[in-house]
């Protein structure tokens, strides 16, 4: 459409609103170095940024929350940027019998929204 | 168990950590008075409060987020308090043909966690 929908255009400027960002983390950072063998470093996608009024609202509840936050900011928090979906991640880890692959469904964010 | 798990005991004091809270809102507050007929006032359960380290972590991603926030607070936000489930709510609303009941699955929070 000619005008960007408020749900998708960030009124705060580029990169300020809720979006997916890659964060590098080592196994040591995560406290996993004693049981995860590989990879030594992970590219973790996380949800960061602000949730201005109606931006990427997760659902009706989030829309209401945004509206009530405008009316009662001390009582109702603004929506916040959280994962809407995840990408499965495979890690190689130590087991009693040797080495095994394990897949985590909820480790790396794939998309973000304001909830 | 004898000791409360860090996921469930709030280190910040009573009522400070992520929990469900009831917020009163009128149809006017919500901007719904032109199409919702009843009820005139809603009891909305919302998720409020802080998410200290590992408190009510939604999943592995939230645990990692909490840990990385401790290491890189400027880059990685703390987890935040969002609904983990919803309670269906029935509203009576105006339609072209009269009055109808409609159920909303994602309007009122039923439980909260830190994501």
């Amino acid at each position: 459409s000619a005008h960007a929908h408020p749900r998708d255009s960030c009124p705060l400027g580029p990169g300020r609103c809720c979006h997916l960002e890659t964060v590098q983390a080592t196994l040591e950072d995560l406290g996993w170095s004693d049981w995860v063998l590989s990879p030594r470093q992970l590219q973790l996608s996380m949800c960061v940024g602000e949730c201005p009024h109606l931006y990427r609202s997760a659902n009706t509840h989030a829309q209401i929350k945004a509206r009530l936050h405008g009316l009662q900011p001390d009582k109702v928090p603004a929506p916040c940027c959280v994962p809407s979906s995840y990408t499965p991640v495979v890690l190689m880890h130590r087991t009693d019998s040797g080495v095994s692959l394990q897949t985590y469904d909820d480790l790396v964010a794939r998309g973000c929204h304001c909830a | 168990s004898a000791h409360a798990h860090p996921r469930d005991s709030c280190p910040l004091g009573p009522g400070r950590c992520c929990h469900l809270e009831t917020v009163q809102a009128t149809l006017e507050d919500l901007g719904w008075s032109d199409w919702v007929l009843s009820p005139r006032q809603l009891q909305l359960s919302m998720c409020v409060g802080e998410c200290p380290h590992l408190y009510r972590s939604a999943n592995t991603h939230a645990q990692i987020k909490a840990r990385l926030h401790g290491l890189q607070p400027d880059k990685v936000p703390a987890p935040c308090c969002v609904p983990s489930s919803y309670t269906p709510v029935v509203l009576m609303h105006r339609t072209d043909s009269g009055v109808s009941l409609q159920t909303y699955d994602d309007l009122v929070a039923r439980g909260c966690h830190c994501a």
Partner: antibody, heavy 118, light 107 residues
Framework: QVQLQQPGAELVMPGASVKMSCKAS????????MHWVKQRPGQGLEWIGV????????SYNQKFKGKATLTVDESSSTAYMQLSSLTSEDSAVYFC???????????WGQGTTLTVSS | DIVMTQSQKFMSTSVGDRVSVTCKAS??????VAWYQKKPGQSPKALIY???TRYTGVPDRFTGSGSGTDFTLTISNVQSEDLAEYFC?????????FGGGTKLELK
């Protein structure tokens, strides 16, 4: 561009061993794992195992433990799979495939056709 | 081991058609499913991972969907170069396993 080069064919006697290679180019070899997959004539695909190319950790399908041994040579960006005590059941096409943590088997070699025959 | 079942060994289609290849897992695999295209004498080509994410360079007529136990690869506007065998694969738990394959043929 990413390429995984495998020899076209190997002919081996029953009871013997074979070591097949998979030479990687077009990316940093140690940034990805290397998987091996078997396809018998007219049949589906079977995952054999995986090797971490930087640390040489290996994880095998239980079915291929004792049959397959995975190794790497970082200096030549080459992964190897040795198959021992060969029988006619081992006659198949063997593929190497690059793998990551989220993109699982994104690039495959052309496959080596192993024929076990006297 | 998790069994991946592709109940249709063969599917007939025409150029321009829309076709759906299905795959069923014997237990919940979340979205840890990938799809591959294989032509005779060639290596498999990766199409989809994480059930619905297309690999770079894969035409958008290929769409993956599903979660849990039921998965679908849909090819809209089938082209002649799409006539091949399609395999699903789970990577939810080791050992990783593949479906038996579905061959897409011309009517």
């Amino acid at each position: 561009q990413v390429q995984l080069q495998q020899p076209g064919a190997e002919l081996v006697m029953p009871g013997a061993s074979v070591k097949m290679s998979c030479k990687a180019s077009g990316y940093t070899f140690t940034d990805y794992w290397m998987h091996w997959v078997k396809q018998r004539p007219g049949q589906g695909l079977e995952w054999i195992g995986v090797i971490d190319t930087s640390e040489s950790y290996t994880s095998y399908n239980q079915k291929f433990k004792g049959k397959a041994t995975l190794t790497v040579d970082e200096s030549s960006s080459t992964a190897y799979m040795q198959l021992s005590s060969l029988t006619s059941e081992d006659s198949a096409v063997y593929f190497c495939a690059r793998g990551g943590t989220t993109v699982v088997l994104d690039y495959w070699g052309q496959g080596t056709t192993l024929t076990v025959s006297s | 081991d998790i069994v991946m079942t592709q109940s249709q060994k063969f599917m007939s289609t025409s150029v321009g058609d829309r076709v759906s290849v299905t795959c069923k897992a014997s237990q919940n695999v979340g979205t840890a499913v990938a799809w591959y295209q294989k032509k005779p004498g060639q290596s498999p080509k990766a199409l989809i991972y994480s059930a619905s994410t297309r690999y770079t360079g894969v035409p958008d007529r290929f769409t993956g969907s599903g979660s849990g136990t039921d998965f679908t690869l849909t090819i809209s506007n089938v082209q002649s170069e799409d006539l091949a065998e399609y395999f699903c694969q789970q990577y939810s738990s080791s050992p990783w396993t593949f479906g038996g394959g579905t061959k897409l043929e011309l009517k």
